[in-house]
């Protein structure tokens, strides 16, 4: 671990209560193919334990979705990944809307610091799929 | 190679016969910008030769496709990447549907073991593009 | 830097004049979360300074876009990432069309050489978003 190879791949545990747009994640070999090696989970949110530049990636698929599902709803369904704490470092890192699709997937490089907690906010009224091959979220330390 | 930097980027060779949803891949400098450095191809399917956590990524674009192409067809076009052999480790790792789009692209971190063979199954009746900048599949070893 | 950990993450600066489809990028901590560590910018285009295999990734979101925005326009909006100079190495590496979506995102592994300049060409008549969480472009050296 001293090499700084911090890495995590998470699967969706559950969505938050109505006024909480955050997705709650879980990880560990007992759950399937998810894991945490360095970063940790704090009430379903991913916390970074080592400074560095990270590759952050995410895929979210909406549950029982067809190409018309997203067009039925007035409020656009959007996924945003950001640092939500500490408050002084709060920022949106990556944002995508579903429009007429059922899946969003993206990735980016970003500097993260020890203690940064990443939140994944799904706005709109559509439930995400909990299938582990359809919805997942991960980070990979790539350099100091 | 002893560092464990196994890596591969493949281009589409061909689709399978009608009852075989698998895509068949090829790689090597003579073909363009595809390559295999560690992993190997077994009848067009990618076989892992070193245990570890890998970043798996894929992009598939449908041939001669417009935003209406996918709406013409009753059966949804879906791409799934999974371990197809050995049978004891068979699992779907990543799954995406095209809906009203012509391209899917995603990536994820996943543990893979020596001997795992990855399959990319394209269900539906639409031909994928063979252009090397539109359809590609790759893996990168990232840590033990 | 001797480890060869060249890495860059860029944010959109501006689009080119009418006959120039290239996106012009910028990077640096003063601008937000973008950075250049090894690669450099030449008139808004990313130039590689170390040979190797790179993970190239991009996300581009169209400005003030809804699912009908892209269908209003006769000419498809397409994003291509390629080597644009030196001319002898000119090639398209990654190509995506927006169709009925507002965002494209993808990534791929590709060999790049010192002096390669990467261009990101956005064809069509729609402006990309300059929000740093919606549009970004990056490369990461992964092995020799």
């Amino acid at each position: 671990e001293s090499l700084g190879w911090d890495i995590a791949e998470l699967q969706l545990n559950h969505t938050g209560p109505q006024q909480d747009p955050r997705l709650y994640w879980q990880g560990g070999p007992a759950l399937g193919r998810s894991f945490l090696r360095g970063p940790e989970l704090d009430k379903g949110q991913l916390r970074i334990r080592r400074d560095g530049i990270y590759m952050v990636h995410i895929q979210v698929t909406l549950a029982i979705c067809s190409s018309t599902s997203t067009s039925r709803h007035h409020h656009p369904t959007t996924l945003a990944v950001g640092i939500c704490s500490p408050a002084s470092r709060s920022i949106s890192l990556l944002r995508l809307s579903f429009h007429q699709g059922c899946t969003i997937a993206s990735q980016r490089l970003t500097p993260l610091a020890r203690g940064d907690t990443l939140c994944t906010n799904l706005t709109g009224t559509l439930l995400p799929s909990r299938n582990t091959d359809e919805t997942f979220f991960g980070v990979q330390w790539v350099r100091p | 190679e002893s560092l464990g930097w196994d890596i591969a980027e493949l281009q589409l060779n061909h689709t399978g016969p009608q009852q075989d949803p698998r895509l068949y891949w090829q790689g090597g400098p003579a073909l363009g910008r595809s390559f295999l450095r560690g992993p190997e191809l077994d009848k067009g399917q990618l076989r892992i030769r070193r245990d570890g956590i890998y970043m798996v990524h894929i992009q598939v674009t449908l041939a001669i496709c417009s935003s209406t192409s996918t709406s013409r067809h009753h059966h949804p076009t879906t791409l799934a990447v999974g371990i197809c052999s050995p049978a004891s480790r068979s699992i779907s790792l990543l799954r995406l549907s095209f809906h009203q789009g012509c391209t899917i692209a995603s990536q994820r971190l996943t543990p893979l073991a020596r001997g795992d063979t990855l399959c990319t199954n394209l269900t539906g009746t639409l031909l994928p593009s063979r252009n090397t900048d539109e359809t590609f599949f790759g893996v990168q070893w990232v840590r033990p | 830097e001797s480890l060869g950990w060249d890495i860059a993450e860029l944010q959109l600066n501006h689009t080119g004049p009418q006959q120039d489809p290239r996106l012009y990028w910028q990077g640096g901590p003063a601008l937000g979360r973008s950075f250049l560590r090894g690669p450099e910018l030449d008139k808004g285009q990313l130039r590689i300074r170390r040979d190797g295999i790179y993970m190239v990734h991009i996300q581009v979101t169209l400005a003030i876009c809804s699912s009908t925005s892209t269908s209003r326009h006769h000419h498809p909006t397409t994003l291509a990432v390629g080597i644009c100079s030196p001319a002898s190495r000119s090639i398209s590496l990654l190509r995506l069309s927006f169709h009925q979506g507002c965002t494209i995102a993808s990534q791929r592994l590709t060999p790049l050489a010192r002096g390669d300049t990467l261009c990101t060409n956005l064809t069509g008549t729609l402006l990309p978003s300059r929000n740093t969480d919606e549009t970004f472009f990056g490369v990461q050296w992964v092995r020799p």
Epitope: - | I64, C65, H75, T125, L127, N131 | -
Partner: antibody
Framework: QVQLKQSGPGLVQPSQKLSITCTVS????????VHWIRQSPVKGLEWLGV???????DYNAAFISRLNITKDNSKSQIFFKMNSLQTNDTAMYYC??????????????WGQGTSVTVSS | DIVLTQSPASLPIFLGQRATISCRAS??????????MHWYQQKPGQPPKLLIY???NLESGVPARFSGSGSGTDFTLNIHPVEEEDAATYYC?????????FGAGTKLELK
């Protein structure tokens, strides 16, 4: 086995409407699209349109204003209607199945054809 | 529209010889890493029959004496050796875009 059987009138008055039914067996209209093609000594083979598994139709722009293709999946029938026929619409009209690949646009099985003469 | 020009219009040939039929497209029929050119055979009183798709792929049940080749805008159907049952009219068709179009046909006649 795969079959496409066509039924329809052989003679149509000028300015009148042509209706042909194509009844298929051996495959499902929810799996394969069906094309319409006509053939005349003067113009050769002309592609008219195709109805896809979802009911979406692509028409030849030259015929779009007077052509209507519909289907009934449960009856395995495709209905071809062309308005305002003139003498130069005299031809053999065929329905044909699209091949397995939905974006390949080739016809792997054809109906026997309906010979249509436009004359008063 | 893409115009397909076939030559010759008529091809008299002896049994056992090689028949070569050409089809030229008014512009490229290539896209997405494929070339969307296909060939059909039509005998009198019958509908056309698919022979070859995507330039060179033989449809199931078609004899190996039929072969297709070409790229860009120039394509060829070869039959070798020609047999009696090959007397027919041969058509090329593209599927690069709508509208799909056909060549005017080449009539293969046995001498």
């Amino acid at each position: 086995q795969v079959q496409l059987k066509q039924s329809g009138p052989g003679l149509v008055q000028p300015s009148q409407k042509l209706s042909i039914t194509c009844t298929v067996s051996g495959f499902s209209l929810t799996t394969y699209g069906v094309h319409w093609i006509r053939q005349s000594p003067v113009k050769g083979l002309e592609w008219l349109g195709v109805i896809w598994t979802t009911g979406v139709v692509d028409y030849n722009a030259a015929f779009i204003s007077r052509l209507n293709i519909t289907k009934d999946n449960s009856k395995s029938q495709i209905f071809f209607k062309m308005n305002s026929l003139q003498t130069n619409d005299t031809a053999m009209y065929y329905c044909a199945r699209n091949s397995y690949y939905g974006n390949l646009y080739v016809m792997d099985y054809w109906g026997q054809g309906t010979s249509v003469t436009v004359s008063s | 529209d893409i115009v397909l020009t076939q030559s010759p219009a008529s091809l008299p040939i002896f049994l056992g010889q090689r028949a070569t039929i050409s089809c030229r497209a008014s512009r490229s029929v290539s896209a997405s890493g494929y070339t969307f050119m296909h060939w059909y055979q039509q005998k009198p009183g019958q509908p056309p029959k698919l022979l070859i798709y995507l330039v060179s792929n033989l449809e199931s049940g078609v004899p190996a004496r039929f072969s297709g080749s070409g790229s860009g805008t120039d394509f060829t159907l070869n039959i070798h050796p020609v047999e009696e049952e090959d007397a027919a009219t041969y058509y090329c068709q593209h599927s690069r875009e709508f509208p799909l179009t056909f060549g005017a046909g080449t009539k293969l006649e046995l001498k």
